[in-house]
């Protein structure tokens, strides 16, 4: 909470002496526009309780962390609500003081009421000057409830608020009907956002147990300590006359904190200072009472005396809140009930004790389950305790069990038993499992069954190339996740082992058994390009491709040609097993089919990027044979062929192919293209004289069709030896295609 206190001086005989002071213990508070943030604000809040206008109040800043409001000219100036705002940013906090007129018709029995969410709040207005009229109750200035004047109980009007919620917080007032509002009893109700002993969002967190009347803040769980107390749980009393979160402030004047009301950040509210009570905080606590508003009871034992500021002051030899604890009997302090260590570790165990006479190193000992007594090797002596440190020999499983710390002095002895659990570090029973591999990485499942004790805190994977003497590489991984070993060498065997650890010093177990994991070949990175393809028949396709030129050896074993027949949903794969190959003949394809063709480099089992695909249409089965082929010799070196076009053509003829062979000859036939498909005759020239020839022909529509009948004809006699046959159509000579 913000260290902000609003003090009201309640010496009311003279209003002009009345003052309000706001004090901040925050670093750099109140410096205004400089780097330390906004200033302290102290003002009268007229939103709910309005008083007649008077001369303006005087605001005086005293140093960087104090501001005082003076200049009250008449008692009515004092009545109402005052607020102080301090702290920067999200810590900006408002502290509220509610002032009642001492001469009012009704006076509050208690001004500030701090209650928990869901509690019943009871506001009690005591009759000071009786009027026989109804009493109006208001909440934050708005009408709330009416009580008949007969309903006063024991001279008090009570307002019961059951099951209060935070929005019920605010300023409440009780006023006689038709009386001046200045004669009202004013109350402040603070409703914590949580039930008793809880704080935080959803009120799930437990308060620390604030002492001496401290109130647990429902947002941050800190104790807002009453004036005069300090510490995280308000366990410590300040010296008389001091206040603030660290007892750093001093009450003004010779009479200390007498006559001052202290208001602190919500949910504390306002009270007298420690040792004082009454409506004007001018009464000292009755014997046996202490603290703010004298709300706490001493109940001192063993000759302790009650100090109204700090509680029990114990005689020599006693301590405790009520002096109930003897200094003479030694006492083991804050010993854990259970400790856990790992096997074969040599832990240090601390044992702290207090007493009178003060325990020394030799008076504290540690006893193992087997009865062995250990003496401390070192002791740390502090004003309130001695801490002995024991160096335990290497732990074995038999050390599990109940150990005992014992302290002995002339004042007596004390002992505390605690359980020691010796745990066995985990050792993998199996090797890690390979999930996937690539050329430069292995994906491994590291979590395996193990002997020893969990939980597994870390998993280490150790790996290095097989048969290597180099240091192991180590990677620490999450036990529940697969791990990727990266930056490995392609086509290399790695020895991989797991090491498991459990929490605590010495929790690392032995390495598990090794396993061999081998990285894959390097991926073939080059993308081929299809450079060409041509149909060599209705079911044959010749494909050529290229590869980009890169420095270094080619990473690849060969090529994979893929032909996708989308109509039938079939893929054909052709393996070309030489990485030097750049062409392939694909046979046995389906005539008339539309194929999508691509090529990939492969290496081992890995495929490289595919070439952009090509779309290839194989011709349907070839056209029927040309009809009525006839041969007629024209000279000793020329024969004319005539024919009729085939019937029922599936498409336009692209060319005719004529086959020429010497009758009875052993050589290969010659093929001659007739590239003008509209022709029905052609002259074959360059033949030998007096030679018998065989002719046949076929048409081509993308693919070659069926052969015609074979015809025979002889050239005329006695010519010279020709160079070889050529074909001449009516228009032009054409080349020979063998």
């Amino acid at each position: 909470a913000v260290d902000l206190t609003l003090l009201a001086n309640l010496r009311l005989t003279d209003p002009q002496r009345f003052f309000l002071t706001c004090v901040s213990g925050e670093a750099g508070a109140g410096r205004g526009s400089d780097a330390w943030g906004p200033p302290l604000l102290l003002e009268k809040d007229d939103r709910i309780v309005r008083t007649p206008p008077g001369p303006p109040l005087r605001l005086a800043r005293n140093g960087s962390h104090q501001v005082t409001l003076r200049g009250f000219s008449k008692p009515s100036d004092l009545v109402g609500v005052f607020s102080c705002v301090g702290g920067a940013g999200a810590r900006r906090t408002r502290v509220i003081y509610v002032h009642n007129s001492p001469g009012a018709h009704l006076l509050p029995d208690k001004v500030t009421h701090t209650v928990n969410k869901g509690d019943t709040a009871v506001l009690s207005a005591r009759v000071h000057k009786e009027k026989q009229t109804d009493v109006i109750w208001k909440s934050n200035g708005s009408y709330f409830y009416t009580l008949d004047w007969h309903e006063a109980q024991d001279g008090r009007f009570l307002l019961q608020l059951p099951n209060v919620q935070p929005p019920s917080s605010g300023i409440y007032s009780a006023t006689y009907l038709e009386a001046s509002p200045l004669g009202s009893a004013f109350f402040r109700l603070i409703v914590r956002g949580c039930g008793a002993g809880r704080w935080g969002p959803g009120c799930t967190k437990e308060c620390p147990g604030c002492l001496h009347g401290g109130v647990c803040h429902d947002h941050d769980g800190e104790c807002v300590c009453p004036p005069g107390f300090t510490g995280t749980r308000c366990e410590q009393a300040c010296r008389e006359g001091r206040f603030g979160q660290s007892c750093q402030e001093q009450c003004p004047g010779i009479s200390g904190c007498r006559g001052l009301t202290f208001c602190l950040p919500d949910p504390y509210g306002c009270s007298c200072g420690s040792g004082w009570r009454g409506s004007q905080c001018q009464e000292a606590c009755a014997p046996g009472h202490f603290g703010a508003d004298c709300r706490l009871q001493c109940q001192c034992q063993n000759g302790g005396t009650c100090d109204r500021f700090s509680g029990c002051v114990c005689p020599s030899g006693w301590h405790g809140v009520h002096c109930e604890k003897s200094d003479r009997i030694p006492q083991i302090l804050n010993m854990a009930s259970e400790l856990e260590f790992n096997l074969e570790t040599m832990p240090r165990i601390n044992c702290a004790a207090a007493g009178n006479p003060f325990p020394v190193r030799g008076s504290i000992e540690l006893r193992k389950p087997d009865g062995t007594v250990l003496l401390s090797t070192k002791a740390i002596v502090e004003p309130e305790k001695t801490t002995a440190e024991f160096e335990v020999p290497r732990l074995v499983l038999a050390d599990s069990g109940f150990w005992e710390c014992r302290v002995s002095t002339s004042g007596g002895q004390d002992s505390r038993r605690f359980k020691v659990n010796v745990k066995v570090p985990p050792v993998p029973l199996a090797a890690p499992r390979l999930l996937t591999k690539q050329s430069r990485q292995l994906v491994v499942s590291p979590l395996v069954s193990f002997s020893g004790d969990g939980p597994i805190s870390t998993v280490r994977l150790h790996y290095r190339p097989q048969d290597s003497t180099m240091d192991w590489s180590t990677i620490v991984v999450d036990p529940s996740e697969n791990v990727t070993l990266m930056n490995l060498r392609p086509k290399t065997g790695y020895s991989v082992r797991v090491q498991l650890s459990r929490p605590g010093e010495g929790g690392e177990g032995a390495w598990g058994p090794p396993t061999l994991m081998t990285t894959d070949c390097p991926e073939p990175l080059l993308q081929p390009w299809l450079e060409g393809w041509h149909v060599e028949g209705t079911d044959r396709l010749r494909v050529s491709w290229s590869l980009p030129l890169v420095p270094g050896p080619l990473v690849g074993d060969g090529f994979l040609l893929r032909l996708w027949d989308g109509t039938r949903g079939q893929e054909r794969r052709e393996n070309v097993s030489s990485p030097q190959a750049r062409t392939a003949l694909l046979t046995g394809l389906t005539p008339g089919t539309h194929y999508q063709l691509d090529v990939q480099l492969y290496h081992c089992t890995l495929l490289g990027p595919a070439s952009p695909p090509a779309h290839v249409l194989l011709p349907p089965s070839g056209p029927p044979a040309p009809r009525h082929l006839h041969a007629q010799a024209l000279s000793d070196s020329e024969i004319q062929l005539t024919w009729k076009h085939p019937e029922a053509l599936p498409g336009p003829i692209s060319k005719y192919v004529v086959e020429v062979q010497v009758a009875g000859g052993a050589g290969d036939p010659l093929w001659i293209d007739v590239d003008r498909p509209e022709e029905t005759s052609t002259i074959i020239r360059g033949l030998n004289a007096s030679t018998r020839y065989l002719f046949r022909m076929r048409a081509s529509i993308q693919g070659l069709g069926d052969w015609s009948n074979t015809v025979e004809e002889s050239t005329l006699g006695n010519g010279l030896q020709a160079e070889g046959p050529v074909q001449e159509s009516r228009a032009a000579e054409e080349g020979l295609d063998q």
Epitope: M486, S546, P548, D598, G608, A610, P612
Partner: antibody, heavy 118, light 107 residues
């Protein structure tokens, strides 16, 4: 310095044509596959077309097939994209890019804007 | 066609923080995946190729990992100049396809 510089973009009516050019410098052009990628306003990258180093093979995205033609002139170190029958959805910044042997699209031009609007 | 899906669409981070961008392919693309960076009004720039190799001149704070269908681009400590859109792209099969992009913006 390895550089690609596109040109030929502009405003054209639906159904119209444009020819984009991409001039390459700072590297030997002929051994590399080249491609066009486009980016519609406020959208991601879309591959359009690719051509092999020799120019013998071309391939197109379905969205432009039959309307766009990619070509190259290795003697002039230039890549082309002939765009016909343009539609409003062809509005984009067109980038030419080099297809590295092992790296993918390793060099990009600065882009040229094509707007198809009536 | 292979679909590439990037997540998240937007990543709001402060300079110095670590950025982790994901890319998932609808089928295996082996390690043939590239990452590109694009700043407003500029052409894309190749950062990572073949899943984990840094392109020439790319700082060591950029790293790529993954194979098959799941890939990650990590920027170990964001510099002011790293706030941009990042695309992944597969080159395993044609058509080469890009992810929808992840915008890394200043928180």
């Amino acid at each position: 310095e390895v550089q690609l510089l596109e040109s030929g973009g502009g405003l054209v009516q639906p159904g119209g044509s444009l020819r984009l050019s991409c001039a390459a410098s700072g590297f030997t052009f002929s051994p590399y596959g080249m491609l066009w990628v486009r980016q519609a306003p406020g959208k991601g990258l879309e591959w359009v077309s690719v051509i092999s180093p020799s120019g013998g093979q071309t391939f197109y995205a379905d969205s432009v097939k039959g309307r766009f033609t990619i070509s190259r002139d290795n003697s002039k170190n230039t890549l082309y994209l002939q765009m016909n029958s343009l539609r409003a959805e062809d509005t984009a910044v067109y980038y030419c890019a080099r297809l590295g042997a092992e790296k993918g699209m390793d060099v990009w031009g600065q882009g040229t804007t094509v707007t198809v609007s009536s | 066609d292979i679909q590439m899906t990037q997540s998240p669409a937007t990543l709001s981070l402060s300079p110095g923080e670590r950025a982790t961008l994901s890319c998932r392919a609808s089928q295996s693309v082996s390690s043939y995946l590239a990452w590109y960076q694009q700043k407003p009004g500029q052409a894309p720039r190749l950062l990572i190729y073949d899943a984990s190799n840094r392109a020439t001149g790319i700082p060591a704070r950029f790293s790529g990992s993954g194979s098959g269908t799941d890939f990650t681009l990590t920027i170990s400590s964001l510099e002011p100049e790293d706030f941009a859109v990042y695309y992944c792209q597969q080159r395993s099969n044609w058509p080469h396809t890009f992810g929808g992009g992840t915008k890394v913006e200043i928180k």
